[in-house]
């Protein structure tokens, strides 16, 4: 996160860290807890690393430096990458992770509400992006979970800024005209959440951007509302019943 500040314990209890253990262990992506046994993240996090057993998912944590060999983590039972995602394209950057064992909810570890299907009418004015990613383009992973308040921008405005790419209706953009605040490398897959009527909702999944926090280059996020059918289909067919945290 560029231009952010330290988060507090329990402030973003749905935020998880997706880490890979090969020779060493490192944080690669963020993710959002959406049910006892489900995490929503970006499909591109698994490019070149599709093997379930190399991944460790840490939930209910604030500081990555607090992780030791004794820190509990979740393992992956199943990775469900959107069927239309292609490594050679930037569309449908969304994936579900089914955990091997369900998590108990606590003050520091609980799910984020999902938006309503095709939610286009809600005007979100209080949106935040969180993650342990770089604090500048040529930076490094941060120890303490960072947060930053970023306004949504219209897809029309976003398309003007990214003429070489197609900004689809299944994407949502956020950023300041002057730059300075944005997600960055290592924040991929993490949440863009907005507070509406007193409730936090998962509006976007951190996907891509041209550099980080550059002027007139907003961050691009997978629009969760556009994938509600897919999310429900995959979680229901795997569970027999939905265990998602949907809005009231």
């Amino acid at each position: 996160i560029v231009g952010g500040t330290n988060s507090s314990w329990g402030e973003w209890p749905w935020q998880v860290s997706l880490q890979v253990k090969l020779t060493a262990q490192r944080h690669l992506c963020g993710g959002s807890l959406i049910g006892h046994q489900w995490v929503l993240t970006a499909a591109h996090c698994f490019d070149g690393l599709p093997l379930q057993d190399v991944w460790r998912i840490y939930s209910g944590i604030l500081n990555l430096s607090d992780i030791t060999k004794d820190t509990p983590f979740s393992q992956i039972k199943e990775i469900i990458i959107h069927q239309n995602y292609k490594v050679s394209e930037g569309n449908h950057d969304i994936a579900l992770i089914k955990l091997q064992a369900p998590l108990n909810y606590t003050e520091f570890q609980k799910p984020i509400c999902l938006p309503s299907k095709g939610d286009t009418s809600t005007i979100y004015t209080n949106c935040w992006v969180t993650g342990w990613g770089f604090s500048k383009e040529k930076g490094e992973i941060q120890n303490i979970l960072q947060k930053v308040n970023i306004p949504l921008v219209t897809n029309e405005e976003c398309q003007k800024r990214y003429q070489d790419y197609k900004i689809t209706q299944r994407m949502v953009c956020a950023g300041y005209k002057e730059g300075g605040k944005d997600a960055c490398k290592g924040d991929s897959g993490g949440p863009l959440v907005c507070k509406h009527n007193g409730m936090w909702r998962l509006v976007g999944i951190t996907s891509w951007g041209e550099g980080c926090a550059r002027r007139e280059q907003p961050g691009v996020y997978t629009k969760v509302a556009e994938y509600m059918d897919w999310i429900l289909e995959k979680t229901q067919s795997s569970d027999g019943k939905a265990q998602m945290q949907s809005p009231a």
Epitope: S88, E89, G90, Q163, Y165, G186, G209, E210, C212
Partner: antibody, heavy 125, light 108 residues
Framework: EVQLLESGGGLVQPGGSLRLSCAAS????????MAWVRQAPGKGLEWVSS????????HYADSVKGRFTISRDNSKNTLYLQMNSLRAEDTAVYYC??????????????????WGQGTLVTVSS | EIVLTQSPGTLSLSPGERATLSCRTS???????LAWYQQKPGQAPRLLIY???SRATGIPDRFSGSGSGTDFTLTISRLEPEDFAVYYC?????????FGQGTKVEIK
């Protein structure tokens, strides 16, 4: 199977014109940026031009700017390169290439993942 | 424009040997925009490595890419007879997209 098939090359006099075509198949053409890359005899590769999926935005190498025009017809799955005011130094094999633009580490990627077999353009009097 | 300089110009090696090809860029290049291609005489180039280190589909694991910033490397761990060809690095970080001049890997 992704296939790119160039046509339209040949011998042309300096100052003349030629239109190259590239017929694409095996993928959703309208989803991909496309490009032309050329290679003069015995020389290295040189990017010529690229065009976004919608066709609404193009890029050119300085060496061809104002003389060459890239375009596409998504309904026909075809990429074009209109070459005007041709010079001897434009003599080359012209390749049509698909531009893959994925995502990695919260940034886009960009590379030529599929190439046609090339068509030879010879500019000589 | 970003200039890519490949070295050496020619690499004379025997099958089974290790080949190390260098590509230096005149400006910082985001590794996501650095690719390597192989070209054999009379053929179109073939993608080997994208994003500086990711192998393209169907490329044997003896090919590997590494590097960041302005220094990139293509390594062929054990040369097979079919690996003798010309190799190009390429950046698409900034237009004009540019290629290195190529490194020819020839049989010693």
């Amino acid at each position: 199977e992704v296939q790119l098939l160039e046509s339209g090359g040949g011998l042309v006099q300096p100052g003349g014109s030629l239109r190259l075509s590239c017929a694409a198949s095996g993928f959703t053409f309208s989803d991909y940026m496309m490009a032309w890359v050329r290679q003069a005899p015995g020389k290295g590769l040189e990017w010529v031009s690229s065009i976004v999926p919608s066709g609404g935005h193009t890029h050119y190498a300085d060496s061809v700017k104002g003389r060459f025009t890239i375009s596409r017809d998504n309904s026909k799955n075809t990429l074009y390169l209109q070459m005007n005011s041709l010079r001897a130094e434009d003599t080359a094999v012209y390749y049509c290439a698909r531009v893959a633009r994925g995502i990695a580490a919260r940034s886009r990627t960009s590379y030529f993942d599929y190439w046609g077999q090339g068509t030879l353009v010879t500019v000589s009097s | 424009e970003i200039v890519l300089t490949q070295s050496p110009g020619t690499l004379s090696l025997s099958p089974g040997e290790r080949a190390t090809l260098s590509c230096r860029t005149s400006q910082f290049v985001n590794s996501n925009y650095l690719a390597w291609y192989q070209q054999k005489p009379g053929q179109a180039p073939r993608l080997l490595i994208y994003g500086a280190s990711s192998r393209a589909t169907g490329i044997p694991d003896r090919f590997s890419g590494s590097g960041s910033g302005t220094d990139f490397t293509l390594t062929i761990s054990r040369l097979e007879p079919e690996d003798f060809a010309v190799y190009y690095c390429q950046q698409s970080s900034r237009t004009p997209w540019t290629f290195g001049q190529g490194t020819k890997v020839e049989i010693k």
